[in-house]
């Protein structure tokens, strides 16, 4: 009996036309939502003038439906048993699942000012930028609508820069009508234990953002894993959002709509400093902000963002060192709300429920030659927003899953 089930599973999780896995893989049957909470700055003047702690108040959720588009350019390669594809991006605002509209205003860090002062360290260039910042009446903080902040706006300061720079700024700009990839993953035909594991991303086996093993593209994209998942396994996956591979470990057994699943979580160790977790040494890319690689819980992904000083963390700086959150008032991290988990059906390796949580932060540093940053006495890793991307298997799919997979085994 067990062998027959194993055989059936192995057949059905292969990523090729005609299998259950392939149908759900090309276009997810699960509704995926991305909720945003924006950190509204309450005291912009005090911060700019006196280098006070930044007081933030989160506002949200603002919800978008995402991942509703089918994979594109799906191409099988029989020779190396891989399938390549593009994952198109799309986001549709869901007013009924949101606290307000896309036109809601927020006081946030001026993304262009913070980035330009970081990218151009030369004092003379900073003075030129300062004159343009003043001319455009820009400041350290700005008021932007949700739509502008997420999807892009024409920045008045950058519009004056004589250099050919992109004048449109947004945390997720460009997003709609773009695609992530090309991904090339193993289809599992020759070896089911490799199914969905990424072979190459954008034509490469490495990212070119990190040194050593940190630069590797490991595991799957977390939508599924090779079948017959064990609790003892460390599940590796790659997330283009955070420009790195990461891992999850088993936490508990969960019953999801009558289906037994394993809850895997991202452990705090994955965010630890190299002092505590030596494997993380290659995620420490500079010595000053990281306080000689002793800070933890924030990841400098500037190399992946054209030099813009973007730092990724967990929401509310969960699992981050006290020095990171010390200059920010109004944060309340808690594991239940702010950690990332994957609920995996162990026989098939399918992720039936997940909550991916991350926070986007921007570094802003004092600058002697940029007036609006001149009074700062310290560096700030400023939280801009945090997001919760969730998906849960639908009732109909769950019934089908119970009858065809778990029911047969039990």
């Amino acid at each position: 009996g067990d062998l027959l089930i194993q055989k059936t599973i192995k057949k059905q999780v292969v990523l090729e036309e005609g299998t259950i896995a392939f149908k759900n893989w090309v276009k997810t049957g699960t509704e995926v939502y991305r909720q945003f909470w924006i950190f509204d700055v309450q005291n912009p003047q005090e911060v700019m003038m006196n280098s006070s702690n930044i007081q933030v108040k989160q506002r949200g959720p603002y919800t978008y439906r995402v991942r509703f588009l089918a994979k594109e350019n799906v191409t099988q390669d029989a020779e190396d048993n891989t399938v390549s594809f593009l994952q198109p991006n799309g986001a549709i605002f869901e007013p009924s699942l949101s606290v307000g509209t896309e036109a809601d205003n927020f006081t946030v860090l001026n993304l262009a000012v913070a980035a330009a002062s970081h990218i151009y360290q030369n004092q003379f260039v900073q003075m030129i930028l300062n004159s343009l910042i003043n001319k455009s009446k820009s400041s350290m903080f700005q008021v932007r609508t949700l739509r502008e902040l997420l999807w892009g706006y024409r920045d008045p300061f950058l519009s004056l820069v004589p250099y050919p720079v992109t004048t449109t700024v947004g945390l997720f700009y460009p997003y709609n009508n773009t695609a992530d990839g090309v991904y090339k993953v193993f289809n599992g035909k020759d070896n089911i234990s490799k199914v969905a594991i990424i072979d190459t991303y954008k034509g490469k086996r490495n990212l070119s953002y990190w040194e050593s093993h940190c630069d590797m593209i490991n595991g799957t994209d977390a939508a599924s894993f090779p079948p017959f998942v064990e609790k003892s396994q460390v599940l590796q996956f790659f997330s283009s959002d955070i420009c790195r591979s990461i891992y999850a470990v088993f936490e508990s057994d969960v019953n999801l709509k009558g289906i037994p699943v394993y809850r895997f979580v991202l452990p705090s160790k994955a965010f630890a400093s190299p002092v505590e977790n030596p494997d993380n040494y290659c995620f420490c890319t500079e010595k000053i902000i990281s306080k000689n690689c002793t800070s933890y819980g924030v990841l400098d992904i500037s190399k992946c963002k054209e030099g813009r000083p973007v730092y990724i963390s967990l929401p509310h700086f969960l699992y981050a060192s006290p020095d990171v959150s010390e200059p920010i008032d109004g944060l309340n991290p808690n594991e239940e709300e702010h950690r990332t988990y994957l609920d995996i059906e162990p026989i098939t390796g399918f992720t039936l429920q997940f909550a991916k949580r991350l926070q986007v932060n921007l570094l802003v540093k004092p600058s002697e030659k940029i007036q609006v940053l001149k009074n700062l006495k310290r560096n700030y890793i400023v939280p801009i927003l945090w997001l919760n991307e969730t998906g849960t298997i639908g009732d109909e799919k769950a019934n089908m899953f119970r009858s065809q997979v778990t029911g047969k085994i039990n």
């Epitope: 030369n122 004092q123 003379f124 260039v125 004159s131 004589p162 002697e368 030659k369």
Partner: antibody, heavy 123, light 107 residues
Framework: EVQLVESGGGLVQPGESLKLSCESN????????MSWVRKTPEKRLELVAA????????YYPDTMERRFIISRDNTKKTLYLQMSSLRSEDTALYYC????????????????WGQGTLVTVSA | ETTVTQSPASLSMAIGEKVTIRCITS??????MNWYQQKPGEPPKLLIS???TLRPGVPSRFSSTGYGTDFVFSIENMLSEDVADYYC?????????FGSGTKLEIK
């Protein structure tokens, strides 16, 4: 020792154009921000234009009204100032100046100067 | 634009005397003031840069103080070779602006 040699000055009529050059003997020329500064007959020093090391960023005071264009050719280790629609008030000794000392890049503005080239605008 | 007011316009001092020149700026420029010496027929020479920093090779009789909007340049014991025009320059913001100059002569 850093040497900056200006050339191209002379007597021109109002409305005419002139191109000044400043040649450097320095291997490190492409690493330095540069400026043109002029000294008027009234002995006033004025910034005319400035350019960053790779030529990507230029700066002109509003008073210069964009009649002047600063540029550089790092392969030739030369700085230029294209002057057009010249007026009598542009009469001055034009200096090119290099920012920064070798060991101390920041905060040493106009650290080295050329001898200057005289521009006279007169009918 | 930050305007720089330099005084006096000219100064006649005896050898060995202390010389002081003052520059006042229209905006707060922290300590971003520089001082230049220009002798006849020569280009200006940077003596003191931002932060009241004496440049290498410049004699220690030259000094400056000041922060914000008020700056003073001093020559402790004037020598005959110090006869020149002296200019201050604010480098806090663009456009860099010079003082109108002080002509130092021997009494």
């Amino acid at each position: 020792e850093v040497q900056l040699v200006e050339s191209g000055g002379g007597l021109v009529q109002p409305g005419e154009s002139l191109k000044l050059s400043c040649e450097s003997n320095e291997y490190e020329f492409p690493s330095h921000d540069m400026s043109w500064v002029r000294k008027t007959p009234e002995k006033r020093l004025e910034l005319v234009a400035a350019i960053n090391s790779d030529g990507g960023y230029t700066y002109y005071p509003d008073t210069m009204e964009r009649r002047f264009i600063i540029s550089r050719d790092n392969t030739k280790k030369t700085l230029y100032l294209q002057m057009s629609s010249l007026r009598s008030e542009d009469t001055a000794l034009y200096y090119c100046a290099r920012h920064g000392y070798d060991y101390d890049e920041e905060g040493a503005w106009f650290a080295y100067w050329g001898q200057g080239t005289l521009v006279t605008v007169s009918a | 634009e930050t305007t720089v007011t330099q005084s006096p316009a000219s100064l006649s001092m005896a050898i060995g005397e202390k010389v002081t020149i003052r520059c006042i700026t229209s905006t707060d420029i922290d300590d971003d003031m520089n001082w230049y010496q220009q002798k006849p027929g020569e280009p200006p020479k940077l003596l003191i840069s931002e932060g009241n920093t004496l440049r290498p090779g410049v004699p220690s009789r030259f000094s400056s103080t000041g922060y914000g909007t008020d700056f003073v340049f001093s020559i402790e014991n004037m020598l005959s070779e110090d006869v020149a025009d002296y200019y201050c320059l604010q480098s806090d913001n663009l456009p860099f602006t010079f003082g109108s100059g002080t002509k130092l002569e021997i009494k």
